[in-house]
């Protein structure tokens, strides 16, 4: 009976999300493998988040709006492990917007989700950021490694969206 009611709840939750995400990919987790964590298909999952790489070339503002429509934000990178996971799926000859910007050009970088900007957990390429005119951050492959660079916000780039996993 308990299992039946849990399944019914799951199905109704799935139906609720179905209107936003036509297809979800779920995995069982938790100590008793009773919880399901889901990401929209074909998003990838890492820890408690889902990631989507958009190959549509758009400005930073339009990229953020695009993520927002999908219930996400441009990616906020919190750890080296997270960055390493993300970059596995990136093309080395492309650049991708991050959810990091400096809208006033005061070198006060801010994350889209208001996560505090921690200078000790940043992955700027050597010599970057280097221009107060360039107020948005991308991740790209340079000098044999992935890192961040400041660029003009209105220049179209690919982008990475991030959202919390859906738990049902």
């Amino acid at each position: 009976n308990f299992m039946y009611s849990k399944t019914v709840k799951r199905l109704s939750k799935l139906q609720e999300y179905q209107q936003y995400y036509p297809s979800l990919t779920c995995v069982m987790e938790g100590k008793d493998m009773e919880d399901w964590s889901c990401c929209p298909t074909p998003w990838t999952s890492f820890q408690s988040s889902c990631y989507f790489i958009s190959t549509v070339m758009q400005s930073w503002t339009k990229s953020q709006n695009n993520c927002s429509v999908m219930g996400a934000d441009l990616v906020v990178i919190n750890t080296k492990e997270e960055q390493d996971f993300i970059t596995q799926n990136l093309k080395i000859n492309s650049a991708y917007f991050l959810g990091l910007s400096d809208p006033k050009g005061w070198r006060h970088w801010q994350w889209v989700d208001q996560t505090p900007y921690n200078k000790n957990v940043t992955f700027w390429h050597s010599g970057e950021p280097n221009s107060p005119d360039e107020r948005c951050a991308i991740i790209n492959f340079r000098s044999e490694e992935w890192g961040w660079n400041d660029v003009h916000c209105h220049v179209p780039q690919k982008s990475i969206c991030k959202m919390k996993k859906i738990y049902i």
């Epitope: 050009g105 280097n130 005119d133 360039e134 660029v151």
Partner: antibody, heavy 121, light 111 residues
Framework: EVQLLESGGGLVQPGGSLRLSCAAS????????MSWVRQAPGKRLEWVAT????????YYPDSVKGRFTISRDNSKNTLYLQMNSLRAEDTAVYYC??????????????WGQGTTVTVSS | DIVMTQSPDSLAVSLGERATINCKAS??????????VNWYQQKPGQPPKLLIY???NLESGIPDRFSGSGSGTDFTLTISSLQAEDVAVYYC?????????FGGGTKVEIK
């Protein structure tokens, strides 16, 4: 007073090359992102190229990508536009302009007087 | 590309009267409360001159008879009391996304 003085325009045959220069004074040139904008006779203004203050990032519209190259020499306070494989539709007055950011966008706040490029056989 | 469409193409206004120029973007050029539209004035034989940035901010040194308004896709430049020196072509421009694009221009003349 800010002054931007373009030079290097002239008559060139289709397929030919031309190098435009823009000498800046009255500004700390090395701190400015710079752009080129052109205006064909009787047509609207068209953005042609942008280069950041350090010269390491350059941007172009598809109409000139691969044919035009923007560069700068901060020691000479000079902006350049190398134009190759010129076409009749590149005929225009070419202006250099200073770029000022505005949040996530920008404005072109100071403009030179322009130099005329005519591509014709 | 974002297409900027200006109207009218030309406008004849009496001295001291109001002139209104419209500009429509093919998609929204707003983000986080700011609109990325600028207005320029170009007199014959001269380069363009920045009048208004961010849809409604008056550039330093520009007379306050010039004003800008609008958001999203629809923007307006208003000259509240036309002066003889305002005879020129006026262009709107979006800087939200490359390639930056300009409107086709509106020629303002004295009636």
């Amino acid at each position: 007073e800010v002054q931007l003085l373009e030079s290097g325009g002239g008559l060139v045959q289709p397929g030919g090359s031309l190098r435009l220069s823009c000498a800046a004074s009255g500004i700390t040139f090395s701190t400015y992102t710079m752009s080129w904008v052109r205006q064909a006779p009787g047509k609207r203004l068209e953005w042609v190229a942008t280069i950041n203050s350090g010269g390491d990032n350059t941007y172009y519209p598809d109409s000139v990508k691969g044919r035009f190259t923007i560069s700068r020499d901060n020691s000479k306070n000079t902006l350049y536009l190398q134009m190759n494989s010129l076409r009749a539709e590149d005929t225009a007055v070419y202006y250099c302009a200073t770029y000022r950011p505005y949040y996530y966008g920008s404005v072109l706040d100071y403009w030179g007087q322009g130099t005329t490029v005519t591509v014709s056989s | 590309d974002i297409v900027m469409t200006q109207s009218p193409d030309s406008l004849a206004v009496s001295l001291g009267e109001r002139a209104t120029i419209n500009c429509k973007a093919s998609q929204s050029v707003d983000y986080d409360g700011n609109s990325y539209v600028n207005w320029y004035q170009q007199k014959p034989g001269q380069p363009p001159k920045l009048l208004i940035y961010g849809a409604s901010n008056l550039e330093s040194g520009i007379p306050d008879r010039f004003s800008g308004s609008g958001s999203g896709t629809d923007f307006t430049l208003t000259i509240s009391s036309l002066q003889a020196e305002d005879v020129a072509v006026y262009y709107c421009q979006q800087s939200d996304e490359d390639p930056w694009t300009f409107g086709g221009g509106t020629k303002v003349e004295i009636k």
